[in-house]
């Protein structure tokens, strides 16, 4: 017969035969022959693949280093690499997750719109009109100002972004 | 260098045992497959058996099935065939063989085996 120019999924060719690959979570140590199979061995502890392969070395998972501010979020196994993620009050500086910063503090006169996760930073807004914010914080949204009215006071400074409007007693006219 | 050298044969009666080795060097042994192969006076090379790199996977030809068995010692780089029940028509000079890639690209210089009373 003529020698395969192409393989069945799951197979490779190699010498115009073709040969089973490894599952994930195992390497290849030999090559099939046309008389044996293919034959693969798992991976060892912290080592992985994650696709049918004919890899003679499996990938080492990724390590999270406490350094960079980083822990496991989900531990690998033979067939998935480690997934990390930040330290509480971190966040990661890119889609791999290989370090961390500390989450933005929206700064006076802005609040925070979202609250940073472990993979993305706080998101901050300004204040409106309205509103204000007097603290640099990851977690504080604008708080409206006070309602002196409904204090039965009035206002005797005005609110900024920054600041409070200042409440104070109603002018009383004397006859 | 690539050495494979076969020991082990020799005259037996039939119905009679014996061991080849084969002793391997200048390769990483426990990473590549083994084979056994013959070639009877007068007739060509035949196929007697094999063996995966970890010894998880192994073929006999059907005129030594049950007969003989092939293993090997990744700790001492040797391969072996086990023969018993030896008939006539095992008579041949037995050779070892290394597979790479797919395919078996290195041979032995051979040892003769003889069956007869």
């Known amino acids: 017969p003529e020698p395969p120019t192409a393989c069945r999924e799951k197979q490779y060719l190699i010498n115009s035969q073709c040969c089973s690959l490894c599952q994930p979570g195992q390497k290849l140590v030999s090559d099939c022959t046309e008389f044996t199979e293919t034959e693969c061995l798992p991976c060892g502890e912290s080592e992985f693949l994650d696709t049918w392969n004919r890899e003679t070395h499996c990938h080492q998972h990724k390590y999270c280093d406490p350094n960079l501010g980083l822990r496991v979020q989900q531990k690998g196994t033979s067939e998935t690499d480690t997934i990390c993620t930040c330290e509480e009050g971190w966040h990661c500086t890119s889609e791999a997750c290989e370090s961390c910063v500390l989450h933005r503090s929206c700064s006076p006169g802005f609040g925070v719109k979202q609250i940073a996760t472990g993979v993305s930073d706080t998101i901050c807004e300004p204040c409106p009109v309205g509103f204000f914010s007097n603290v640099s914080s990851a977690f504080e949204k604008c708080h409206p100002w006070t309602s002196c009215e409904t204090k039965d006071l009035v206002v005797q400074q005005a609110g900024t972004n920054k600041t409070d409007v200042v409440c104070g007693p109603q002018d009383r006219l004397r006859a | 260098e690539v050495q494979l050298l076969e020991s082990g044969g020799g005259l037996v009666q039939p119905g009679g045992s014996l061991r080849l080795s084969c002793a391997a060097s200048g390769f990483t042994f426990d990473s590549y497959a083994m084979g056994w192969a013959r070639q009877a006076p007068g007739k060509g090379l035949e196929w007697v058996s094999a063996i995966g790199a970890k010894g998880l996977s192994t073929y006999y030809a059907d005129s030594v099935k049950g007969r003989f068995t092939i293993s090997r010692d990744n700790s001492k780089n040797t391969l072996y065939l086990q023969m018993n029940s030896l008939r006539a028509e095992d008579t041949a000079v037995y050779y070892c063989?290394?597979?790479?890639?797919?395919?078996?690209?290195?041979w032995g210089q051979g040892t003769l085996v003889t069956v007869s009373s």
């Open positions: 063989a290394k597979a790479a890639r797919g395919k078996f690209d290195y």
